[in-house]
């Protein structure tokens, strides 16, 4: 059956031979209606990429550099299956490119000019492409030829395989730049030896190199890693201190109509029957005809790449930056230590309008990028299409798991001028009901629920976390008869109560009328039995404070809070009747942009923050007529975090634990991708 056939692309006679063997052996173990293999032979990996894009083939396995080529337009391929190494219990699908130095040296990443460098080899990922790509804009001009620029940047180097005649400085630490193990400083172990012997000041290698060469922890403790934020960390902190995370070997397919489920079904079956130590007659991860045919010989199996993970996310911001710099050879005109405009991520067109007005008023210091969901915004910040946004705590958790950092906190209670330096405790997550109802925390089953959005703190993580510990399952849509929880599956009962309008029904953005704090309260007013919101929501939308038609006549006393002990209290008593304390919303950014974002925002709030009194004739950053656009409307200021500068420290142990528990029920495709 052609639609059940995966056309594998082979790039040599030997690969084609192995592919045919793969095809025949799969035929013998799979049912006739299962997936099948067909073989397509091309002259090179780039030809395979083009063939897949043109629908003449379906899959090929590629190294990271080629995954980058495959992702570029017009190819637009995406990773679908990753080879893993190591054990099934602890599968490794990535390695980390690191810069290793001796502990007794005293320079940082931005002080490498004039040092001596040790590389694994010319054109190799961890040893050359990544470090030189990331340093590219610091290299002296002209930057072409690249080897000459690198030779003039470092005071001496060992770059195996470089041309020692044309670029003698690149071979200063290893005369001749031998391109094999005859050169004692060749490859990973060689580059590390070059550092260890004192020939060089820095070695560009893999994270595992130091462990493979120094079994003794005391010896390893003599070395450190250089981090991109110009700090140092110990060699076992490579996950938090690396130049780039590099995928090892990856199967790619078309982004649209790419047969990824079929490819996974095929490879999953293949690893079951012909994986490591499975079969004598055919082995997926070795071959009598040559090395690394179709798949790497060192691979132990395959893992399915999460569907939300596109090539940009898979390759990572640092890797793409490095490769793009090398390929395109372009650098910003401004010096790299100067802050460029910050690209704010706006959710849907309402936030975009406010962002545009901010951009005009900021004299171009703020630019705007849009996305339809918070998770799409986080992904854009990760890959460099945007720089920052303010997030509810639930999304600060997801952003943190995706490598972003909190930069500033929204403060709601502290008056100026102390606001900027005050760390607030947080706000209360509450359950609101109509005073006229007889609901309590203990009889919510079968009722109609209103939530700010799936994944948000007060509207989801806290109430559903508490509910989960009571009912011990994730079928919240069965617990409530119906509800509106924007971001739920469209056919779920938790989208039934949402108001839309139609194409935006249940979308987790402001196009859905029942989205966010105000939206969830509106849902309660118009259709629901209980709303999960922040403690300020009722006071902010009653007594004429919200002029919208649905809210203008509402009275605060018509609503009450549900307490966990089964009692109810006035909305004026949240301190004595709440579900939990929630961390304030916070601005997040990539680590490399955090300082610039902080400096710019502190400056912007001095001009457009809560000190502006007349928002009818001035732009106000924290005002959007109860709609919480870009920031919560009750924000008094954005406050410095001081030492709470990681998502764990910012959110606090208790909240992180609660959200981690709720991950069993996670519907976050981004979180799945970021924890891959």
């Amino acid at each position: 059956v052609p639609e059940k056939s995966v056309r594998w692309c082979a790039v040599s006679e030997h690969e084609a031979t192995k592919c045919q063997s793969f095809r025949d052996h799969m035929k013998s173990v799979l049912p006739s209606n299962g997936p099948s293999v067909a073989c397509v032979k091309k002259a090179s990996h780039l030809d395979c990429i083009r063939a897949i894009a043109a629908n003449e083939a379906d899959a090929v396995t590629l190294d990271a550099g080629l995954v980058y080529d495959a992702y570029l337009a017009p190819n637009n391929l995406k990773p679908v299956v990753a080879e893993f190494y190591g054990s099934k219990e602890d599968p490794q699908t990535f390695y980390y490119a690191v810069a290793v130095v001796k502990k007794d040296s005293d320079f940082q990443m931005n002080q490498l000019r004039g040092r001596k460098s040790c590389h694994t080899g010319l054109g190799r990922s961890a040893g050359w492409n990544i470090p030189i790509g990331l340093l590219y804009c610091d290299l002296p001009e002209p930057r072409k030829p690249l080897e000459k620029a690198v030779a003039n940047f470092f005071s001496g180097s060992c770059v195996p395989c470089a041309d020692g005649t044309d670029f003698p400085q690149l071979c200063q630490l290893c005369p001749g730049c031998g391109c094999s193990t005859l050169n004692q400083y060749f490859s990973y172990s060689g580059a590390f030896k070059c550092l260890k012997d004192g020939a060089g000041d820095v070695a560009f290698v893999k994270h595992s190199t130091i462990f493979e060469n120094l079994a003794n922890k005391a010896d390893r403790d003599q070395y450190e890693l250089l981090c991109l934020d110009n700090t140092r960390k110990s060699v076992d902190e490579y996950k938090d201190c690396h130049l780039a995370r590099v995928p090892s070997h990856t199967v790619v397919a078309r982004s649209v109509g790419g047969k990824e489920d079929l490819i996974w079904e095929l490879l999953n079956q293949a690893q079951e029957h012909f994986g490591k130590d499975k079969s004598k007659e055919f082995q997926l991860f070795s071959s009598p005809h040559g090395k690394d045919l179709l798949f790497k010989d060192s691979a132990h199996g395959f893992l399915k790449v999460p569907p939300r993970m596109d090539a940009k996310m898979y390759l990572g911001y640092e890797y793409i930056t490095a490769i793009r710099n090398l390929r395109e050879g372009t650098c910003p005109e401004a010096p790299t230590d100067e802050c460029k405009p910050v690209k704010w991520c706006a959710l849907s067109h309402h936030e975009r309008l406010k962002c545009d007005e901010w951009s005009v008023n900021s004299a171009g210091k703020i630019e705007c990028e849009s996305a339809e969901t918070t998770e799409d915004c986080i992904a854009k910040i990760m890959n460099g299409e945007a720089d920052a946004m303010s997030l509810d705590g639930g999304f600060v958790y997801i952003a943190g798991m995706c490598g972003l950092v909190p930069v500033l906190a929204e403060n709601y209670n502290t008056p100026n001028p102390n606001c900027e330096n005050t760390a607030e405790e947080g706000y209360f997550a509450v359950a609101v009901v109509k005073s006229s109802s007889d609901l309590t925390w203990d009889n919510l089953k079968g009722k109609k629920s209103c939530h700010t959005a799936v994944g948000r703190t007060a509207g989801w993580n806290i109430p559903m976390g508490l509910l989960y510990s009571k009912i011990n399952h994730c079928r919240f849509d069965e617990f409530f008869s119906e509800g509106c929880a924007p971001g739920s599956e469209k056919n779920s009962s938790l989208c039934k109560l949402c108001m839309g309008p139609s194409p935006n029904l249940c979308e987790p953005n402001n196009k859905e009328g029942y989205y966010g704090y105000t939206g969830a309260f509106r849902c309660l007013v118009e259709k629901g039995d209980v709303a999960f919101v922040k403690h300020q929501t009722v006071p902010q939308n009653t007594g004429g404070k919200n002029p919208d038609a649905w809210a203008k006549n509402l009275k605060e006393e018509d609503y009450e809070l549900l307490c966990l002990d089964g009692s109810r209290k006035s909305v004026q008593e949240p301190a004595n009747c709440h579900l939990a304390r929630a961390p304030n919303h916070a601005v997040v950014a990539r680590k490399d942009k955090a300082d610039c974002v902080q400096t710019l925002l502190l400056d912007q709030q001095r001009m457009f923050g809560s000190s502006v009194t007349d928002c009818s004739s001035n732009f106000c950053l924290f005002e959007s007529k109860t709609k919480d656009l870009l920031f919560r409307d009750d924000t008094v200021c954005l406050a410095k975090l001081h030492d709470r500068n990681t998502y764990e420290k910012y959110l606090g142990e208790e909240y992180v634990k609660a959200v981690t528990n709720l991950r069993k029920c996670s519907t976050s495709p981004l979180l799945e991708a970021c924890t891959f």
Epitope: E357, V360, S616, S617, F619, K627, L629
Partner: nanobody, 117 residues
């Protein structure tokens, strides 16, 4: 609430010029920010140029150096001078003063600009 009416659009050849006007029904002197947006068929509405009460301006990269935004508070009018027009500038152009919040769909009729030979 101030009503805004756009005019001045039309059919023009590539390289040609047009001047759009947006006349307000009341005073614009105290309005913080005014802007021109455009929307081509099947595209999102995008910011073309904006101007603050103090006269500071911002332009989309695609129109920098070709378009100029200005406001005449005495005449309660916002302008967009468009030079060196290109086919990709073809769109309906709208003006806004952001004064009705960011939430309601409060766009006017707009004015059609078509750049074609």
């Amino acid at each position: 609430e101030v009503q805004l009416v756009e005019c001045g659009g039309g059919l023009v050849q590539p390289g040609g010029s047009l001047r759009l006007s947006c006349v307000a029904s009341g005073s614009i002197a105290s309005i913080a920010t005014m802007a021109w947006y455009r929307q081509a068929p099947g595209q999102q509405r995008e910011l073309v140029a904006g101007i603050t009460r103090g006269g500071s301006t911002k332009y989309a990269d695609s129109v920098k150096g070709r378009f100029t935004i200005s406001r005449d508070n005495a005449k309660n009018t916002l302008y967009l001078q468009m030079n060196s027009l290109k086919p990709e500038d073809t769109a309906v152009y709208y003006c806004t003063d952001y004064s009705r919040g960011y939430y309601q769909d409060y766009w006017g009729q707009g004015t059609q600009v078509t750049v074609s030979s």
